[in-house]
Each structure stands twice: as structure tokens, then as C-alpha cells.
Interface confidence: low
């Protein structure tokens, strides 16, 4: 008698290892004999697919070499035309030994940055990932963590994090090890011992000492007033990633000496700087034998520049000090007619304050020289090009009179405003700061020979100049 199909052995979940055989059995009772078809994830398995073997009139489905992608729901459907078709389904769970699909690679990282060593794995059950550093299991802490992906993340990398690492993927079926990789920690150049400033007598020998460290070991170069050191002997030694450099100098003039430690990280360089000043005893103290007197400025040329009602020093070595000093300024100002609009107001302020120095009244009236920082600001920032031209002309004797030489101060011989709060005069009209300067393109390729500090802003400024000079 005709009999509708009945599945007597329903499909069950089958566990199989990759590359092994997996078989589903779908036993059917019926008359006439049924036609049995198989699906995986609702997609028909073709009879001629060579990855499968279908036997026993379709009741046995064998996957000949299980792959990771064979995971899914397998169903058999039996139909013989009597009654309805019947179906039974079961799952194939592909079990897989751990496999590292993205192993870690060698890493060079700068101290303080974040390092990530990848370790992406496959496996079923999902492998747990741990890491080995050297020969010991790596312990996680607030800086070091194994991510969900298996990758190792190290925050704020330290020198001691350098070493050999490998990741380990483990599940119930086995363990996989990555190859050993190297984490190299590079450290920015850092100065451990900076050169010390010295106040010495003319003709002394001085040794400046600079010690630096870094990974790789930095090189040390010495700069004198912005240029490579031209004289003096340098001795260097390297020990335990520390470089020690000694510069021996014969002192004939004051100078700013900078030790620069540099090391390379890939295509980039890191540098550390430390500076020392060599000053010559008595070099910049004001002379005590100034002959002159204090009086209010009554001229015309410097009216807009000198502070109102300021006392100025009138030098009695001239027969008529007021007239002689006014003439000096007048001569110098004529030369300024051709300079740039950036330079001119700064130069005018400098010249007026240099020729009509601020006067400190007292038993001995004392002219107060301009602070070195303001002089350097004019020379190196506002009027860099013009100053070079002027110095050239002076050397070649192109100026009409010797008077002009008196109108340009020699900045290096002026006192610093930080040596003593009253030892030098500020230029109230010269108001600038480094932040302004950074926003302008370079005006000249020449860099300042010293790092000019910020000048204090003046509340009485009648103009503010932002020179086109790059401080970077």
C-alpha cells in the first residue's frame, strides 16, 4: 500500500573538525521510495558537488573534508507523492584548532606613545589569547591590556616594555603560537646635564659639559651665538646610552653656547637643547665716569618716540649737548627713509633711546643703556636685512661721517634687562611678542643668533609692530 514518507532518524547536531569527515543521516520509511534532497542554510546541495557524497538513496550526506565555512543548518526533505513532503534539520558545528590569522609584527615605537601588537585568531571554540614576553607570561595592568581581538595594547610605552613578544591562542582542541616579534622602544633625545653659565675673565679657558641620552644614542652638536662652533676642542664619550660632550673654549668675547642633542626616529628627528652664557667680568657694567646731566627732552626729532616728560642724559663732552645729540639723531633718521615700514618705527625708537638715553638722576647722573633684548629685537627681527646692509657699509667706510657709528648700539655690549631690574632701559614703543611673529612668513633666511625672549608689553605703546619673521 502507498505510504507517506516518515523520517525515522531525525537529524542531530554534528560536531566536526576542519579537514575531517562529517555525516548527516536521514532515515526515511515510505512507499514508493522517496526522493530525498538536502539543503544547507536553505540552499539546495547539488548532487554533483564533489565536496559532498550522497548515498543510501539520499539518506546519508557526507561532507568529505570539512571547511570552516561549512558551518550551518543542514536539512533533508523526503517526498514520494503520497501525502506531504517531510523535513528534518540539524546543525553542523565546525570545530577548529586555534589558528593565528594576523600574527604580530616587529614594532619600533617612541617612548610615551601607544603600541598595538596585532594577534587575530580563528578557532571554535573561540580561542583565548595570551601573550608571552621573553620567557614569561605577560601580566596585564593599567597600561598593558589584551584587547577583545587578541591584540596587545600598551599605553604610554616605557623603555622597560622593550623585548621579545609572542601571542598564544588556546582552545579545547589545541594551542597555536605566533612567531617571536621584537618591540623596540625609542626615546627622544634628552639632556641629562646642561652646560653651566660662567662669568670669567678675558682670556680664560672654560670647559662646557653636556650630557644627553636617548634611544638611539643621540649626537651632540655645539652652537655659538646661533652658528656652528668655529673654535674650541670637543671631546666625546658614549657609555650605557649616555653621550658626554665637553667643549673647551678660550674666551675672548661673551657668547651664548647651545648644546643640541639629536637622534633619529624613522624619518623624523628629535632634539633637545640647553644653553649656557659665557660672560666676561666687567664686560657690560655701565661706566661710572659719564660726564653729563639729566634734563627733559626739548628737541623735535624724537618727540613721538621718547616718553613724555622723560629725563634724558645730555653728554657734556659736547659743547652744546642738546644740539649735538639732536644732530646725531637727525643724521641717522635720514638714513632710515629707505628702510621697510616694519623696520623704520622700531629703528627710530632704538636710535632715539640710544642717543638720548634715559637718565637716572642722583648724585652722579647716570645714563641708562637700552636693554640688550630690545636692541636684539630690532637687529634680529624687525630690521634683519637693513642691519646687515648697514654693518657692511660701516665696515667698508661708506657712511659720510663717523657720527653714524655712534647712532647704532652694539647689542652684545648692552646689559640684559634680567640682570638687574633697573640696569637698562626698555623701549616703550617696541611692543611685540613671539605669538605674533609665528603667524607671518619668513622675511629673511637668517635666523636670530640668539633666542630673543619676550619683551614685556608696554601700556604706553603708540604703535604695535608685527615683523614678518618666522620664529619656528
Amino acid at each position: 500500500l502507498p505510504k507517506a514518507p516518515v523520517i525515522t532518524t531525525p537529524l542531530e547536531t554534528v560536531d566536526a573538525l576542519v579537514e575531517e569527515v562529517a555525516t548527516f543521516m536521514c532515515a526515511v520509511e515510505s512507499y514508493p521510495q522517496p526522493e530525498i534532497s538536502w539543503t544547507r542554510n536553505k540552499i539546495l546541495i547539488k548532487l554533483f558537488d564533489t565536496r559532498y557524497s550522497i548515498r543510501e538513496n539520499g539518506q546519508l550526506l557526507t561532507i568529505l573534508s570539512v571547511e570552516d565555512s561549512d558551518d550551518g543548518i543542514y536539512c533533508c526533505t523526503a517526498n514520494n507523492g503520497v501525502g506531504g513532503a517531510v523535513e528534518s534539520c540539524g546543525a553542523l558545528q565546525v570545530k577548529m584548532k586555534p589558528k593565528i590569522t594576523r600574527p604580530p609584527i616587529n614594532v619600533k615605537i617612541i617612548e610615551g606613545l601607544k603600541a598595538v601588537l596585532p594577534c587575530t585568531t580563528m578557532g571554535n571554540p573561540k580561542p583565548s589569547v595570551s601573550w608571552i614576553k621573553g620567557d614569561s607570561p605577560l601580566r596585564e595592568n593599567s597600561r598593558i591590556a589584551v584587547l577583545e581581538s587578541g591584540s596587545l595594547r600598551i599605553h604610554n610605552v616605557q623603555k622597560e616594555d622593550a623585548g621579545q613578544y609572542r601571542c598564544v591562542a588556546k582552545n579545547s582542541l589545541g594551542t597555536a603560537y605566533s612567531k617571536v616579534v621584537k618591540l623596540e622602544v625609542e626615546v627622544f633625545a634628552r639632556i641629562l646635564r646642561a652646560p653651566e653659565s660662567h662669568n670669567v675673565t678675558f682670556g680664560s679657558f672654560v670647559t662646557l659639559h653636556c650630557t644627553a641620552t636617548g634611544i638611539p644614542v643621540p649626537t651632540i652638536t655645539w652652537i655659538e651665538n646661533g652658528n656652528a662652533v668655529s673654535s674650541g676642542s670637543i671631546q666625546e664619550s658614549v657609555k650605557d646610552r649616555v653621550i658626554d660632550s665637553r667643549l673647551q673654549l678660550f674666551i675672548t668675547k661673551p657668547g651664548l653656547y647651545t648644546c643640541i642633542a639629536t637622534n633619529k626616529h624613522g624619518e623624523k628627528f628629535s632634539t633637545a637643547k640647553a644653553a649656557a652664557t659665557i660672560s666676561i667680568a666687567e664686560w657690560s657694567k655701565p661706566q661710572k665716569d659719564n660726564k653729563g646731566y639729566c634734563a627733559q627732552y626739548r628737541g623735535e626729532v624724537c618727540n613721538a618716540v621718547l616718553a613724555k616728560d622723560a629725563l634724558v642724559f645730555l653728554n657734556t663732552s659736547y659743547a652744546d649737548p642738546e644740539e649735538a645729540q639732536e644732530l646725531l639723531v637727525h643724521t641717522a633718521w635720514n638714513e632710515l627713509k629707505v628702510v621697510s615700514p616694519v623696520c623704520r618705527p622700531a629703528a627710530e625708537a632704538l636710535l632715539c633711546n640710544h642717543i638720548f638715553q634715559e637718565c637716572s638722576p642722583g648724585v652722579v647722573p647716570t645714563p641708562i643703556p637700552i636693554c640688550r633684548e630690545y636692541c636684539l629685537a630690532v637687529k634680529e627681527l624687525f630690521c634683519a636685512k637693513e642691519w646687515l646692509v648697514m654693518e657692511e657699509k660701516t665696515h667698508r667706510g661708506l657712511y659720510r661721517s663717523e657720527m653714524h657709528l655712534l647712532s647704532v648700539p652694539e647689542c652684545s655690549k648692552l646689559p640684559s634687562m634680567h640682570w638687574d631690574p633697573t640696569a637698562c632701559a626698555r623701549l616703550p614703543h617696541l611692543d611685540y611678542n613671539k605669538e605674533n611673529l609665528k603667524t607671518f612668513p619668513p622675511m629673511t633666511s637668517s635666523k636670530p643668533s640668539v633666542d630673543i625672549p619676550n619683551l614685556p608689553s608696554s601700556s604706553s605703546s603708540s604703535f604695535s609692530v608685527s615683523p614678518t619673521y618666522s620664529m619656528t
Epitope: 646642561a194 652646560p195 653651566e196 653659565s197 662669568n199 651664548l256 640647553a274 644653553a275 649656557a276 652664557t277 660672560s279 657694567k285 633684548e373 640684559s416 634680567h418 640682570w419 638687574d420 631690574p421 633697573t422 640696569a423 633666542d451 625672549p453 619676550n454 614685556p456 608689553s457
Partner: antibody
Framework: EVQLVESGGGLVKPGGSLRLSCAAS????????MNWVRQAPGKGLEWVSS????????YYTDSVKGRFTISRDNAKNSLYLQMNSLSAEDTAVYYC?????????????????WGQGTLVTVSS | DIQMTQSPSTLSASVGDRVTITCRAS??????LAWYQQKPGKAPKLLIY???SLESGVPSRFSGSGSGTEFTLTISSLQPDDFATYYC?????????FGQGTKVEIK
Amino acid sequence: EVQLVESGGGLVKPGGSLRLSCAASGFTFSSYSMNWVRQAPGKGLEWVSSISSSSSYIYYTDSVKGRFTISRDNAKNSLYLQMNSLSAEDTAVYYCARDRYDRSGYYYVPFDQWGQGTLVTVSS
Amino acid sequence: DIQMTQSPSTLSASVGDRVTITCRASQSITSWLAWYQQKPGKAPKLLIYKASSLESGVPSRFSGSGSGTEFTLTISSLQPDDFATYYCQQYNSFSWTFGQGTKVEIK
């Protein structure tokens, strides 16, 4: 090692005088400006006076002008404060302090080294 | 004279805390400001000069910032040795003046 040691403090009657000394060692005394700073019992710090390395520049706080005199003897590595017309308001620990310039030579660094202080008590 | 005002006068904190002390000047002193630490019965110790320059030998947990009239001293992670009184001082112009002090005590 830099050392500053004050001496000369003690009990004095109002209107009286006292001379404080500060002995310096461990650095080239003649190259540094020196200062006196005081601290009344349980109160804050108050700058009193400063003198430059060659005694060219001398400064006082307003309340001591005309009464106190700062001086130094570079040959003896010593700093002094002569205090006259003392009053109860001058009661304090008096510290001698050095200053310097940083490595650039541009920037002034105030009071980088201090002595242990000497107590001046003005009371009748 | 330039007046210096510190706040707070007293500050209670625990080891590991980030501590900030403020100092205000009655007029602009650009960056000419120093910070000192003083422990009972001891002389003050210079920590910071020029508003933000760390004095040699001072731990890097101390930092200074500000310019003009507003300045701050920050201790990034308070240590047992840091419980003391802190003073700011302007050296922009004579007379040089100190703040009234901020006492940092254990909470």
C-alpha cells in the same frame, strides 16, 4: 654645597638696634645678588631688601627705608643688615636668600637658595 | 605696590589628588612670578620661576602656568611630602611682594 647661615638675631627693646649677618659658602659670593626676606610669627613672607653683586644697586621695602641698611663684604663672603629704630612690627624670622640668572643669562631666578633664618624679637 | 592674592587660603586634599592653587596680581606682571614651598620651621624652597619654569631638582609633578594677572600652581598627584604652605611672589617691580600663602593639609 651652597650654604647660607644667618646670625645676630635676638631680643631687643623697641627703638633699639641689631645687626644681622649672613655667612655664604659653596658658591662665588661676589657674583650673586643677595636679599633679606622676613616672616613674622605665623604670618607670610615679606621681602625686605636686596643688594647687587657689586653693591651698585640697593633696594628696600617702604616700611624699612631710612631705618635698615643692607651691605656686603665680598672679601669675607658676608651679607649684613643693620636694623635701627626697631619696633614690634619688625619681629620676625629674617632669612638671607641668594638669587641668580638661569642658563640663558636672560631670566632672573629669585631666591633660589635660603638660609635657615634668625629670629629677631622686638619687645619691651 | 603690586598686591598678590592667593586662593584658597587652606586646601584639604588626599595623597594622589590633583591640586591647583591660584595667585592673582593687582596689575600685570607678565611672567615674572615665582612659587615657593615652605614646611613648618623650615626656610622656603623655590619650585617655579618665570611663571612656568621648573627649578632644577623639583619633581615634575609640580607645574606653573599663567601670565598677566592670573597664575596657577598645579600638583598633578599629591605626595605625602607635598603637605606644606605654598607662596607666590612677583618680581616684576620693586617692592617685590608675596601672596598670603595657601596651606595644603591632609583631608
